[in-house]
């Protein structure tokens, strides 16, 4: 999988789209997970509705939402109130049983708020760009949503 880069601005919302073959993935729930290192299981940030027919309903986990257009074949993830620590490597996944297929690898880049001059460098406009990642990326793990929360069980 190539890695698609999405740029967002701190404090704003970022929408990430993951297109897929609607026939091939018919009846499958979808998920969004974050990779926090080169190794580790892909731990879920948020997944679509338990009832596949209701996948169009937006589901939230903290500041992250997911909704699935199962006919059009587009999974959409919204990251609200984007923060620098939301940057990173993510995956859109299609679930079947205990397995998960990667639909898209996504790199979220968080740019400093142009109205906040404390740390800002030269700012780019947010958008989407393709980058060709040959690097071997296998696994992922997730993060605690808020500093101080007790996160997922550690894996190694």
């Amino acid at each position: 999988h190539n890695t698609t880069v999405f740029q967002g601005v701190a404090g704003q919302s970022l929408q990430v789209s993951c297109p897929y073959d609607s026939m091939k993935h018919w009846g499958r729930r979808k998920a969004w997970c974050r990779q926090l290192g080169e190794k580790g299981p892909c731990q879920r940030v948020v997944s679509t509705h338990n009832l596949w027919l209701l996948s169009f309903l937006r589901r939230w986990n903290g500041s992250t939402a997911i909704t699935d257009d199962t006919l059009g074949g587009t999974l959409t993830i919204t990251l609200r109130n984007l923060q620098p620590h939301d940057a990173g490597l993510y995956q859109c996944q299609s679930l079947h049983g205990s397995e998960a297929d990667t639909l898209r690898k996504v790199l979220v880049e968080v740019l400093a708020d142009p109205l906040d001059h404390r740390d800002a460098g030269d700012l780019w406009f947010p958008g989407e760009s393709e980058s060709f990642e040959d690097a071997h990326v296998e696994h992922s793990i997730s993060r605690s949503l808020l500093e101080g929360e007790i996160p997922f069980p550690p894996t190694s």
Epitope: T3, V5, Q7, L36, G37, E38, P84, H85, D86, A87, G88, L89, L107, V108, E109, V110, L111, A112, D119, A120, G121, D122, L123, W124, S131, F132, E133, D134, A135, I141, R143, S144, L146, E147, G148, E149, I150, P151, P154, T155, S156
Partner: antibody, heavy 119, light 107 residues
């Protein structure tokens, strides 16, 4: 194999300038945040600055803000640190590192380049 | 800024010993901690991230635990190549701050 190779260190007088470079190979450079971490002689580690994968935003430690400028050239797989108004307390080994985006830990490090600020 | 304090500052051990070193944060940092190993004249190497996740190629004798403000790095059976200085780092929310280090020496 991920490799980071720093260059540009040396002796400079207080108030002077220096530009460090870091040549990266073994990974898709444009998909990774990068950073510099320094270590004063006989001391611990100090994060200096970080840069997003496109170079769109930079973040600096308070100790260098306004004096150091971090940039990158993704077409050349190279990271730069422009250091101006150097002070004696900037004397350190400067390490180029690959930062895991959004997490702020450094998974690969260069061998370091020594910057000495002295009259 | 959150301060990271490591103890002890130095530690003597023999090959085969089980050793532990600690890192204390001045405020709750959840599980947002990394550990590095540094040998004299060399660059640091990442050992663990998010408290307990071993980085690629790190031997299983290295393990991490803790959450909130108190963290521990354990080497279950010290090997000759493990004598080095170990640093903890607060991660996930900047500024990224390091502890002052624990030096593991041969007894």
């Amino acid at each position: 194999e991920v490799q980071l190779l720093e260059s540009g260190g040396g002796l400079v007088q207080p108030g002077g300038s220096l530009r460090l470079s870091c040549a990266a190979s073994g990974f898709t450079f444009s998909n990774y945040y990068m950073a510099w971490v320094r270590q004063a002689p006989g001391k611990g580690l100090e994060w200096v600055a970080s840069l997003t994968n496109s170079g769109g935003s930079t973040y600096y430690a308070d100790s260098v803000k306004g004096r150091f400028t971090l940039s990158r050239d993704n077409s050349k797989n190279t990271l730069y640190l422009q250091m101006n108004s150097l002070r004696a307390e900037d004397t350190a080994v400067y390490y180029c590192t690959r930062e895991w985006a959004g997490s702020g830990y450094f998974d690969y490090w260069g061998q370091g380049t020594l910057v000495t600020v002295s009259s | 800024d959150i301060q990271m304090t490591q103890s002890p500052s130095s530690l003597s051990a023999s090959v085969g010993d089980r050793v532990t070193m600690t890192c204390k944060a001045s405020q709750n940092v959840g599980n947002n901690l990394a550990w590095y190993q540094q040998k004299p004249g060399k660059a640091p190497k990442l050992l663990l991230y998010y408290t307990s996740n071993r980085f690629t190629g790190v031997p299983s004798r290295f393990s991490g635990s803790g959450s909130g403000t108190d963290f521990t790095l354990t080497i279950s059976s010290v090997q000759p190549e493990d004598f080095a200085t170990y640093y903890c780092q607060r991660i996930y929310n900047s500024p990224w701050t390091f502890g002052q280090g624990t030096k593991l020496e041969l007894k």
